[in-house]
Amino acid sequence: LIIGFGISGRHSITVTTVASAGNIGEDGILSCTFEPDIKLSDIVIQWLKEGVLGLVHEFKEGKDELSEQDEMFRGRTAVFADQVIVGNASLRLKNVQLTDAGTYKCYIITSKGKGNANLEYKTGAFSMPEVNVDYNASSETLRCEAPRWFPQPTVVWASQVDQGANFSEVSNTSFELNSENVTMKVVSVLYNVTINNTYSCMIENDIAKATGDIKVTESEIKRRSHLQLLNSKAS
């Protein structure tokens, strides 16, 4: 969490951002909130990016003002116009690119004063893994697949019954480059699976951590997956 304060002649206002991560090829949110004003026409929102000459986005007098927007963000940004009045200056970024990573500044002017806060935005690829019994195998085997990751993640297997066990000798992980030549498909196979056990396939890079769990009994399986973004720090 980053909280910034204005230092102009007018009163300073509190602006708060949250470090976040964008999934390349998808839409992302750069989060920013501020002390609201009662008049929309008195609010100015400017998003800037370190190392970029033009603006990322500007919103003033109740509408977008994009005449000074940098080319790299053309047609890809939007604020939540109906939420600005309640202090939401978050920016929606369409079709996130690897090059969108960096330090952003959310700069706010209202009738109460000015304020700004920085935000670290990471970009990469992350996806939910699916674990299944691998029915192509001769012995009981689990296969964990996740379609899109970048940078290359680590994959670790764990089990509820054999807590702390190292499965690296009985697993095999491969990374296959996807067609856009950036993200990769992750496939990990675990051998010598025992029944009445729950196994977890954990995939992690510096942006996200995802886990696919599968409960294996003699008569059925049950799976669930979850994903968490790392380093979501507020400023």
Epitope: E130, N132, V133, Y135, E218, E220, R223, R224
Partner: antibody, heavy 116, light 106 residues
Framework: EVQLVQSGAEVKKPGASVKVSCKAS????????IHWVRQAPGQGLEWIGE????????NYNQKFKGRATLTVDKSSNTAYLELSSLRSEDTAVYYC?????????WGQGTLVTVSS | DIQMTQSPSSLSASVGDRVTITCSAT?????MHWYQQKPGKAPKGWIY???KLAHGVPSRFSGSGSGTDFTLTISSLQPEDFATYYC?????????FGQGTKVEIK
């Protein structure tokens, strides 16, 4: 007495969506997964997916992923199946069933007819 | 996906006959489950975990098998047994059913 009561028959045009409900009673709704299965006229059974009512976690048959959406409303003990972009091949009886244990429970089925 | 092939697809038998339905999976699935369905009705769980009879299922029914090959047997067919029987696996996603075996009166 455990019961799963489904909504009534539907007739839809190709490209439309349908939402079928399944109201559970007689047991703790959040303790058992709900499965959805369909059966085309004169055909066999086809598994669509499952949902855990305790946290709405879902697993889908890849064939239906993106077209089928499973949801629950815990306040009314009701599970829902929504199927979008309907085509004539989706004409079938849709069943909800409770997680299979020594006794299984099924809804009475909902006939969805897709016709122009 | 694991494919399940039942045989025969249909059979005609008389009351008192011994009837055997087989189900073959494209991969080892450890356990099989069986359903009975009558026309216009929802399926009913009939045999679970290969050989355990569901609540209320008569003892003339039995199930056996392992790996990829499983069998449902009716030792002495009764009038109420005329129905369609489906095998089912929940050992690999997506869960799948056999195409069904229709048991008809001769």
């Amino acid at each position: 007495e455990v019961q799963l009561v489904q909504s009534g028959a539907e007739v839809k045009k190709p490209g439309a969506s349908v939402k079928v409900s399944c109201k559970a009673s007689g047991y703790t709704f959040t303790n058992f997964w709900i499965h959805w299965v369909r059966q085309a006229p004169g055909q066999g059974l086809e598994w669509i997916g499952e949902i855990d009512p305790s946290d709405s976690y879902t697993n889908y048959n890849q064939k239906f992923k993106g077209r089928a959406t499973l949801t629950v409303d815990k306040s009314s003990n009701t599970a829902y199946l929504e199927l979008s972009s309907l085509r004539s091949e989706d004409t079938a009886v849709y069943y909800c069933s409770r997680e299979i244990t020594t006794v299984d429970y099924w809804g009475q089925g909902t006939l969805v007819t897709v016709s122009s | 996906d694991i494919q399940m092939t039942q045989s025969p697809s249909s059979l005609s038998a008389s009351v008192g006959d011994r009837v055997t339905i087989t189900c073959s999976a494209t991969s080892s699935i450890s356990y099989m489950h069986w359903y009975q369905q009558k026309p216009g009705k929802a399926p009913k769980g009939w045999i679970y975990d290969t050989s355990k009879l569901a609540h209320g299922v008569p003892s003339r029914f039995s199930g056996s098998g392992s790996g990829t090959d499983f069998t449902l047997t009716i030792s002495s067919l009764q009038p109420e047994d005329f129905a369609t029987y489906y095998c089912h696996q929940r050992r690999s996603y997506p869960f799948t059913f056999g195409q069904g075996t229709k048991v008809e009166i001769k």
